[in-house]
Structure formats: structure tokens, C-alpha cells
């Protein structure tokens, strides 16, 4: 790497993937193994993130970008940049601080993550329950008995639950 010639800051010309090495007269040196610099002009390279334990590598570290992790099967990411992994549960369950627990009666969860949510209250829309809810599935609302005229067979699916979001207790 050639010596930078900037009169102001000789380090400003060091590109991403290098660092300005004070020990070598401010020459741009390549980042050592397992480190990176994502911007130019850096005086040090950052240590690469290591995806260990319940984390697995989604993208390898390079000299210009950090590694990215996701979670091993049976777990899913939590927090910014997959900072933690939390376990999946079965449909019909939710994760609590003590582990996976079945949804209480009157609630459901159709995913492996997220929380148990109340069944749709069909009567609020003036409808009747066409298919009962379970721990894994919401109720299916149908027209109210008064609406059932010959030839009418429309079934209204329940309003979608709030955004699955990723989680509570």
C-alpha cells in the first residue's frame, strides 16, 4: 500500500479494509485476519463478530464488512442485528420466562413465535362463530343467523390479529 500524501490528514486516504498504521509512519496497512474496517480513514480495524453457540454465521466477515449471524434451527433472532436468540415454540404455545407454555383457553398462536392472542369476537361484528377456535387457530366468523337467506353462503374470515410482532412474555 502506498504512503498517503494528504497534507491535512494522511489517514484520510486509507480505504475501507485498511487502517492507518501509526507504527509504520501512517502507512495504510490491510486489516489483520478476523478484523475489518467498513469505512476509510480508520486508525484501527474492528474485530469481526463471531457466531458461536446458538448463533450461526449468515455472512462471513470480510476485510470491509462485519460477519452477520442468525440463529440455529429451533431458535429465532431477537434484538437489533440478531443480538440474542430465543427458542421457537410449537403453534398453540407462547414463550414465557419459564419456557414454552400452551395458550390459555380463548387465545391462539398460529406461529412458532409471538404471543397467544384472543380469539376474534364474532359478535362484535354482528356475526356468529362458524368454526370454533383452538389453541392454534382463530375462530372463523360467519354471517349472523338472520343473514342466512337461501343461496347466501359467504364466509367472512376473521380480521387479522395485530402484527405478529416478535414477542413478549
Amino acid at each position: 500500500f502506498e504512503r498517503t500524501r494528504s497534507l491535512q490528514d494522511p489517514c484520510s486516504n486509507c480505504p475501507a479494509g485498511t487502517f492507518c498504521d501509526n507504527n509504520r509512519n501512517q502507512i495504510c496497512s490491510p486489516c489483520p485476519p478476523n478484523s475489518f474496517s467498513s469505512a476509510g480513514g480508520q486508525r484501527t480495524c474492528d474485530i469481526c463478530r463471531q457466531c458461536k453457540g446458538v448463533f450461526r454465521t449468515r455472512k462471513e466477515c470480510s476485510s470491509t464488512s462485519n460477519a452477520e449471524c442468525d440463529c440455529t434451527p429451533g431458535f429465532h433472532c431477537l434484538g437489533a442485528g440478531c443480538s440474542m436468540c430465543e427458542q421457537d415454540c410449537k403453534q398453540g404455545q407462547e414463550l414465557t420466562k419459564k419456557g414454552c407454555k400452551d395458550c390459555c383457553f380463548g387465545t391462539f398462536n398460529d406461529q412458532k413465535r409471538g404471543i397467544c392472542r384472543p380469539w376474534t369476537n364474532c359478535s362484535l361484528d354482528g356475526k356468529s362463530v362458524l368454526v370454533n377456535g383452538t389453541k392454534e387457530r382463530d375462530v372463523v366468523c360467519g354471517p349472523s343467523p338472520a343473514d342466512l337467506s337461501p343461496g347466501a353462503s359467504s364466509v367472512t374470515p376473521p380480521a387479522p390479529a395485530r402484527e405478529p410482532g416478535h414477542s413478549p412474555q
Partner: antibody, heavy 118, light 110 residues
């Protein structure tokens, strides 16, 4: 980006009341238990209270039982702590914290100082 | 008096390994997960270990957690000056229906 911003702290006389607020953003507030944790000057962390996603269950630490009330307004993404009959020993920095499903506090507010003194 | 018991202080020299203990009972550590937090002066606590031994990303693998029975411990190897902080253990307590913290351990790097 998850943000928790406490407000409402200040100086109050013994026996007085104060209501703390915590404005939350960057996540689906109604999906999470939320907590208050406090720290007296030079002392350790003390859990005060937490509240279930829909507000239907509330739990209190010994120091808060009977005097403090935790509540939330999911439409405003805000957590509250109503503190009554305040004592000098309630002087502390009060932190609002988001409780992850796995039971941990990963996101904390910056804290608001409550001083109880005459 | 904290429900979880930690030594008030611990110390070590750079490069050393130090261990901080946390003792509880069957209703907290014995039946629930343990969490460890690091707190630097004037800042909010930072999660260090969750679910007994899991590290969030960004926490160096010099930090490790373990649990046995009604006790837990946090080990810090290759001690560095920036590790000087207060460390707290925490767990849910089934009897109290609440979170309990240890009294905290002030770690000094000599």
C-alpha cells in the same frame, strides 16, 4: 431502534406523590411485559414492578406493594408508575425496561431521578 | 438485604480470571434462569448473560455464565481494565412473583 424515555422525576416531599412515565418506541409495545427497576444512590438494582402486555396482571416488589401502581396505555405506547406516600428511602434513579419473552432486560431507559426530601 | 447473595467486591490483575458468585434458593435460581448485568458508573445496566450461559452478540467470549443448583457464577477471563464495573445477577422468584437481584459486586482491575 428501540427507545425508552422516562420522565416525571424530581424533588418531592415525604408523604407526597409523583407519576413517572416511560414513552416507548421502535417495537410493538403491546406485545411485551414492561418493568420499572430502581437504583438508590450508591446502591444496587432493585426491581419495583412489572405489568403484562394487556395490563391484566401486575407484580410488585416488597418496597412498592401498597404504595405504587404500575399501569400502561398501549394506545399511547406509554408505561406509568404512580408513586404515593413517598419516603426518603424511595430516592433513586428509576429505570423503565422492556422485558423480553426470554425474561431478560436488554433495553433500558436512561433513568429519571426521584428525590424525596423535605 | 438482597434475596440473591453476591460478594460485595472482587478484584484481579489484567489477564487474570475472576469469578463472581450468586447464591439463591429453590424458588429463584433453583427453578428459573439466571441473568447477569454489567453497570458502568452513571449508565444504565447492560445485559451480559441471559438464560444462565447465553451471551448476546457484542459481549466478548471472555465472559461466561454457569448455574448449578441454587447458585450461579459469572467468570471473566483475560481481565481488562474496561471490565471494571458493578455486576449484578438476577432471576425470577416464584414465591415472591417478582424479579430479584443480587446486591451487586464491584469489580476492580488492579
Amino acid at each position: 431502534e428501540v427507545q425508552l424515555l422516562e420522565s416525571g422525576g424530581g424533588l418531592v416531599q415525604p408523604g407526597g406523590s409523583l407519576r413517572l412515565s416511560c414513552a416507548a418506541s421502535g417495537f410493538t409495545f403491546s406485545d411485551y411485559y414492561m418493568s420499572w427497576v430502581r437504583q438508590a444512590p450508591g446502591k444496587g438494582l432493585e426491581w419495583v414492578a412489572n405489568i403484562k402486555q394487556d395490563g391484566s396482571e401486575k407484580y410488585y416488589g416488597d418496597s412498592a406493594t401498597g404504595r405504587f401502581t404500575i399501569s400502561r396505555d398501549n394506545s399511547k405506547n406509554t408505561l406509568y408508575l404512580q408513586m404515593n406516600s413517598l419516603r426518603a428511602e424511595d430516592t433513586a434513579v428509576y429505570y423503565c425496561a422492556k422485558e423480553e419473552r426470554i425474561g431478560t432486560y436488554y433495553y433500558w431507559g436512561q433513568g429519571t431521578l426521584v428525590t424525596v426530601s423535605s | 438485604q438482597s434475596v440473591l447473595t453476591q460478594p460485595p467486591s472482587a478484584s484481579g490483575t489484567p489477564g487474570q480470571r475472576v469469578t463472581i458468585s450468586c447464591s439463591g434458593s429453590s424458588s429463584n435460581i433453583g427453578s428459573n434462569y439466571v441473568y447477569w448485568y454489567q453497570q458502568l458508573p452513571g449508565t444504565a445496566p447492560k445485559l451480559l448473560i441471559y438464560r444462565n450461559n447465553q451471551r448476546p452478540s457484542g459481549v466478548p467470549d471472555r465472559f461466561s455464565g454457569s448455574k448449578s443448583g441454587t447458585s450461579a457464577s459469572l467468570a471473566i477471563s483475560g481481565l481488562r481494565s474496561e471490565d471494571e464495573a458493578d455486576y449484578y445477577c438476577a432471576a425470577w422468584d416464584d414465591s415472591l412473583s417478582g424479579w430479584v437481584f443480587g446486591g451487586g459486586t464491584k469489580l476492580t482491575v488492579l
